[in-house]
């Protein structure tokens, strides 16, 4: 640790005195202290001499000697009082700048330690301190306002009692800056803009911060725009607004617009795109396939994306048949706006009934005209099966009719015994009919197919079963020949409940 000579913590001298402070260390040493006049420095190796031959009250202060090479960073200090009866205060600063909630040191140094008992801090022109101002005093350092607040940004004076009267220091301005959490907050509206050539447009870029010291600008395709700035202060925030008004837009106004704001903490920017078009437009699209297949009883949402400018003047969902003349219930249709120029329209069709298959059209209108997008909805059904015994061209024939969607496949089984459904152990013979005859196949309806099984002689202790299946499910019908004719068994369970 360096050593200061004279080796006293405090030194009191009169104005005009010669003061010599010597610091000695193991290595090179250096002096530090408040900026003040009249000092000269002389160094020789491991010692440094700070001297003045004309001390004034302005030399009052704490002088510290450090050894830069010392890893422990040891230092020694001496406080010098230059006791001037006419000048009780040495004010080191004109202004003190701190952030809110920091301690603010107002460096009024007493030039005479004897005066410490009668010191006080006041605002200029003798005004008392604001309520809740918590401060302390040190003759070496001055007054400290603890946890300074923005509202305490004032001009202060230090007061000392000398011979029964108060002597004021020159004033110190305290600037308490609000803590800036980051770059200014930004808004750029609209987030997207479309205009037809010749229309008017407005783009507003605004920034706000707790501190007034920030800059904001609007740029178009990297060119800074010269726009008058409006400033405001509300909700304890400073606001700066740039408004770009375009009376008649043209294609050169289109492009990217960026709102940029910066302060000591950094920069924020946000962008939007301005599109200029020749005329109104209306585009309908769907991410879904326009041809939909859904199992009966299930639900479906039909979604249409609309891109339009100007906005829609009308829209609706229409059922185009072929079954009933019912129309979709308005409560099942909803619209969500993705942004100003893009919307999604959804038609919800819960628990679909057979009569709800068909074409659904979404129609929309704006000044650009009408547009429509049509979905075709086909319902899937599990097969329904029936078998009859008949004679065709004199031959005994089992006739199986199967109805469902998609088109069912047909398989015939012959099994031993009388049963509602052949199981593997009983099966005597299996015939697949790869090409059953299609009896009816209309759009949005079930497909009905017919399969024939010619049987020369019906075996009485056997069962003939027609099975039909598709991607939705399967159905079957068992035919049991009996002496008095034939007996047919539909399956036990009723396979289809819409």
């Amino acid at each position: 640790i360096p050593v200061i000579e004279p080796s006293v913590p405090e030194l009191v001298v009169k104005p005009g005195a010669t003061v010599t402070l010597r610091c000695v260390g193991n290595g090179s040493v250096e002096w530090d202290g408040p900026p003040s006049p009249h000092w000269t420095l002389y160094s020789d190796g491991s010692s440094s001499i700070l001297s003045t031959n004309n001390a004034t009250f302005q030399n009052t202060g704490t002088y510290r000697c450090t050894e830069p090479g010392d890893p422990l960073g040891g230092s020694a200090a001496i406080h010098l009082y230059v006791k001037d009866p006419a000048r009780p205060w040495n004010v080191l600063a004109q202004e003190v700048v701190v952030f809110e909630d920091q301690d603010a040191l107002l460096p009024c140094l007493l030039t005479d330690p004897v005066l410490e008992a009668g010191v006080s801090l006041v605002r200029v022109r003798g005004r008392p301190l604001m309520r809740h101002t918590n401060y302390s005093f040190s003759p070496w350092h001055g007054f400290t306002i603890h946890r300074a607040k923005f509202i305490q940004s004032q001009d202060y004076q230090c007061s000392a009692l000398m011979g029964g009267r108060k002597v004021m220091s020159i004033s110190i301005r305290l600037k308490v800056q609000k803590v800036i959490p980051g770059p200014p907050a930004l808004t750029l509206v609209p987030a997207e803009l479309v205009r037809i050539r010749g229309e008017a447009a407005q783009i507003v870029c605004s920034a706000s911060s707790v501190d007034v010291n920030f800059d904001v600008f609007l740029q178009h395709n990297n060119t800074k725009l010269a726009i008058p700035q409006q400033s405001d202060f509300h909700n304890n925030r400073y606001q700066k607004v740039l408004t770009l008004n375009l009376d008649q837009v043209d294609f050169q106004h289109a492009g990217n617009y960026s709102c940029v704001a910066s302060n000591v903490q950094g920069k924020h920017s946000t962008s939007m795109f301005f599109r200029v078009v020749e005329s109104a437009y209306l585009n309908l699209s769907s991410e879904q396939n326009l041809i939909q297949e859904v199992t009966v009883g299930e639900g479906l949402n039909l979604k249409v994306m609309v891109e339009a400018y100007p906005g829609l003047q009308g829209f609706n969902w229409t059922y185009l048949g072929p079954f009933s003349d019912h129309q979709p219930e308005p409560k099942l249709a909803n619209a969500t706006t993705k942004d100003t120029y893009r919307h999604t329209f959804t038609l919800s069709l819960p628990r679909l009934k057979p009569s709800e298959a068909g074409r659904y059209s979404f129609l929309a209108r704006n000044p650009g005209g009408w547009r429509a997008l049509t979905f075709e909805l086909t319902l899937r059904y599990p097969p329904e099966v029936s078998v009859i015994w008949t004679f065709i061209n004199g031959s005994g024939t089992l006739l199986c009719a199967a109805s469902g969607y998609p088109q069912p496949n047909v398989t015939w089984l012959q099994c031993s015994g009388h049963t509602d459904r052949c199981d593997e152990a009983q099966v005597l013979q299996v015939w697949d009919d790869p090409y059953p005859e299609v009896l009816s196949q209309e759009p949005f309806h079930k497909v009905t197919v017919q399969s024939l099984l010619t049987v020369e002689t019906l075996e009485h202790n056997q069962t003939y079963e027609c099975r039909a299946h598709n991607s939705v499910g399967s159905g079957s019908w068992a035919f049991i020949p009996i002496s008095a004719g034939a007996h047919t068994h539909p399956p036990d369970e009723f396979l289809f409940t819409p």
Epitope: P35, L92, A93
Partner: antibody
Framework: QVQLQESGPGLVKPSETLSLTCTVS????????WSWIRQSPGRGLEWIGY???????KYNPSLMSRVTISADTSKNQFSLKLSSVTAADTAVYYC???????????WGQGTLVTVSS | QSVLTQPPSASGTPGQRVTISCSGS????????VNWYQQLPGTAPKLLIY???QRPSGVPDRFSGSKSGTSASLAISGLQSEDEADYYC???????????FGGGTKLTVL
């Protein structure tokens, strides 16, 4: 070795505020005092002001109404703000470390600030 | 107009001794220490002399400073081509309550 580096915009519009930051490395701004000095062809070297004790400032009387110097000890930086600038404020701005005896032993490399519309 | 007065230019040949003067008043040089700075073209000023005659480490002893009354001078002996630069004097000014500078002297090595 103490190093100082000025940063900030090189172009400022008239009537706006000039803002510069000096980042100090190799030493703490809690010791010594830290100054802003500018140099222009018309006026030579001109002391703007200094900050010490991390918040106490003194300014050149000719600039006092327009200048604020502040410090951020957590970042070891000090800043200059000069408001209502005119073309006369066009200069190279230096930050420097001040020492007892009133000399500047370390300087930043300087940054040219032009005031123009 | 600078507070401290310096000749705008000075010159000398290599090996020569050159002196640059700096004149002030009692509120600056008369009461306070004088410091000198060297500014090479395109660079920041560099401390050359502090407290009238003290050289920071790294400054050759060819550079020396002196003060008398309200004037100061910088002497460069054994002039070298790399000494070609602008030289500024500076001192604390009691009335300004801050440092003041001279207008600078451009030294040319012929």
């Amino acid at each position: 070795q103490v190093q100082l580096q000025e940063s900030g915009p090189g172009l400022v519009k008239p009537s706006e505020t000039l803002s510069l930051t000096c980042t100090v490395s190799g030493g703490s701004i809690s010791s010594f005092y830290w100054s802003w000095i500018r140099q222009s062809p018309g006026r030579g070297l001109e002391w703007i002001g200094y900050i010490f004790y991390s918040g106490s400032t003194k300014y050149n009387p000719s600039l006092m109404s327009r200048v604020t110097i502040s410090a951020d000890t957590s970042k070891n930086q000090f800043s200059l703000k000069l408001s209502s600038v005119t073309a006369a404020d066009t200069a190279v701005y230096y930050c420097a470390r001040g020492r007892l005896g009133n000399y500047f032993d370390y300087w930043g490399q300087g940054t040219l600030v032009t005031v123009s519309s | 107009q600078s507070v401290l007065t310096q000749p705008p230019s000075a010159s000398g040949t290599p090996g020569q001794r050159v002196t640059i003067s700096c004149s002030g008043s009692s509120s600056n040089i008369g009461n306070n220490a004088v410091n000198w700075y060297q500014q090479l073209p395109g660079t920041a000023p560099k401390l050359l002399i502090y407290s009238n005659n003290q050289r920071p480490s790294g400054v050759p002893d060819r550079f020396s400073g002196s003060k008398s009354g309200t004037s100061a001078s910088l002497a460069i002996s054994g002039l070298q081509s790399e000494d070609e630069a602008d030289y500024y004097c500076a001192a604390w000014d009691d009335s300004l309550n801050g440092p003041v500078f001279g207008g600078g002297t451009k030294l040319t090595v012929l």
